[in-house]
């Protein structure tokens, strides 16, 4: 059961995480005015990824995208290729941890096969995790950077009567968005990899029945018990039934070969 | 047609509250945000502030913040502006004017009311 | 509050004549973020309310003649009519509509020689 729900909440937790770094690649909101020089504004200018946005007190909302490839900073390309790839990685890992589920029986698949790819959703849910925190930071760096470096603008050669307010930008809601996400992300890709463990065969089930040497009547109860093969198998982890109610997870699946702890 | 109907001229003494309506049709009124600004005679235009009529977020001129008071009434698609404390400086005509969606500019204005203060 | 100051604050000229006026503004009126001037030109006669002409220090409001013109970044603003018609004879505005509040200019009154 606790290997099911881990599996389960990992799957959960990951699809929250990817939906949650697509909605971020998307959003204008990367970077917002700071309004603390200029609260008066009736001009709102925010960022994204893809475009920038002025917001007018008058509702009317202007939008351009960036037109231009080659005349971007190369860190905001950085970070649109780390978003892009956190997408794709955990795009990819959906797909193959809803095959990798405990709780989907897909043909005759083998339960090592499910081990392996909850393992593989999970290292590409935390590489996009990763991707996407990476992603952020180094936004999030760059806009620090700017900002001191406009501030330092802001306070010098000012010595005319006009005055010239240079915009700064400070965080916007899609890097809290993006961190919340990557980290989600990357929780549910540990949660899988810990699943994996789990699931793993470290025995052989046999569905014969089980011969004890022992005169005492044991109850056969058919893929209830761990049968040792006798070849040096690691003992330490047989489980012992007591004949009492089983979790999900302890019951047989009878198309494949293994039961794993 | 886009028209801003206004209420009629006041004559007010020192002290007394005002309250100006300003009847918008034409356009849906909820969309829009509604201006007020007033001219003394023989000067130039002030600004007193704004309202939008679906949130009843105002935006006030900091020098009227404490005297002014915007508010509408949706169902009849009425803007008012009330102004208390008045004194023989408020002698003006004040007019309201609708946010043009856009640009930041009103685009119509109504035909103004006269206000008079005097003792 | 930026200080919005337009000159000449009078101005006689003849019909045909090409007139400009100026506003200068105490802080910059251009938003990085579009490259936008939000200044706007409003023209008022006598006894009416202003009408709107430019904005965006240069867009002209539909239904204004081609012979209005707006121009000018930052701080400094012109307004250009090109070849003055006797309806033109008003008092013109500049305004600020980037900070709060808005502010105008004291008008440019033209009037006829």
């Known amino acids: 059961m606790a290997v099911t729900a881990c599996q389960g909440l990992g799957f959960v937790v990951s699809l929250i995480g990817i939906a949650g770094i697509i909605a971020a690649t998307c959003m204008d909101q990367w970077s917002t005015q700071d309004l603390y020089n200029n609260p008066v504004t009736a001009v709102f200018n925010y960022q994204g990824l893809w475009r920038s946005c002025v917001r007018e007190s008058s509702g009317f909302t202007e939008c351009r995208g960036y037109f231009t490839l080659l005349g971007l900073p190369a860190m905001l390309q950085a970070v649109r290729a780390l978003m892009i790839v956190g997408i794709v990685l955990g795009a990819i890992g959906l797909l193959v941890s809803i095959f990798a589920l405990k709780c989907i029986r897909i043909g005759s698949m083998e339960d090592s096969a499910k081990a392996n790819m909850t393992l593989t959703s999970g290292i590409m849910f935390i590489v996009s995790g990763l991707c996407a925190i990476a992603g952020v930071s180094v936004f999030a760096n760059m806009l620090v950077t700017n900002f001191w470096m406009s501030t330092a603008n802001m306070y010098t050669g000012m010595g005319g009567m006009v005055q010239t307010v240079q915009t700064r930008y400070t965080f916007g809601a899609a890097l809290f968005v993006g961190w919340v996400a990557g980290g989600l992300t990357l929780i549910g890709g540990v949660m899988m990899c810990i699943a994996c463990r789990g699931l793993a065969p470290e025995e052989t089930n046999y569905k014969a029945v089980s011969y004890h040497a022992s005169g005492h009547s044991v109850a056969y109860k058919p893929g209830g018990f761990k049968a040792s093969t006798g070849f040096g198998s690691n003992t330490k982890n047989k489980k012992i039934y007591d004949g009492g109610a089983r979790t999900e997870d302890e019951v047989q699946s009878y198309p494949s070969k293994h039961d794993y702890v | 047609q886009v028209q801003l109907v206004q209420s009629g001229a006041e004559v007010k003494k020192p002290g007394a509250s005002v309250k100006l309506s300003c009847k918008a049709s034409g356009y849906t009124f909820t969309s829009y945000w509604m201006h007020w600004v007033r001219q003394a005679p023989g000067q130039g235009l002030e600004w007193i502030g704004m309202?939008?009529?679906?949130?009843?977020?105002?935006n006030y001129n900091e020098k009227f913040k404490s005297r002014a008071t915007l508010t509408v009434d949706t169902s009849t698609s009425t803007a008012y502006m009330e102004l208390s404390s008045l004194r023989s400086e408020d002698t003006a005509v004040y007019y309201c004017a609708r946010r043009y969606y856009g640009s930041i500019s009103p685009d119509y204005w109504g035909q103004g009311t006269t206000v008079t203060v005097s003792s | 509050d930026i200080v919005m100051t337009q000159s000449p604050s009078s101005l006689s000229v003849s019909v045909g004549d090409r007139v400009t006026m100026t506003c200068k503004s105490s802080?910059?009126?251009?938003?990085?973020?579009?490259?936008?001037?939000?200044l706007t030109w409003y023209q008022q006669k006598p006894g009416q309310p202003p009408k709107l002409l430019i904005y965006?220090?240069?867009t002209r409001e539909s239904g204004v003649p081609d012979r209005f013109s707006g121009s000018g970044s930052g701080t400094d603003f012109t307004l250009t009519i090109s070849s003055v018609q006797p309806e033109d004879f008003a008092t013109y505005y500049c305004q600020n509509d980037y900070s709060y509040p808005f502010t105008f200019g004291g008008g440019t009154k033209l009037e006829i020689k």
């Open positions: 802080q910059s009126l251009l938003n990085s973020g579009n490259q936008k001037n939000y």
């Open positions: 309202i939008h009529p679906n949130s009843g977020s105002t």
């Open positions: 965006w220090a240069s």
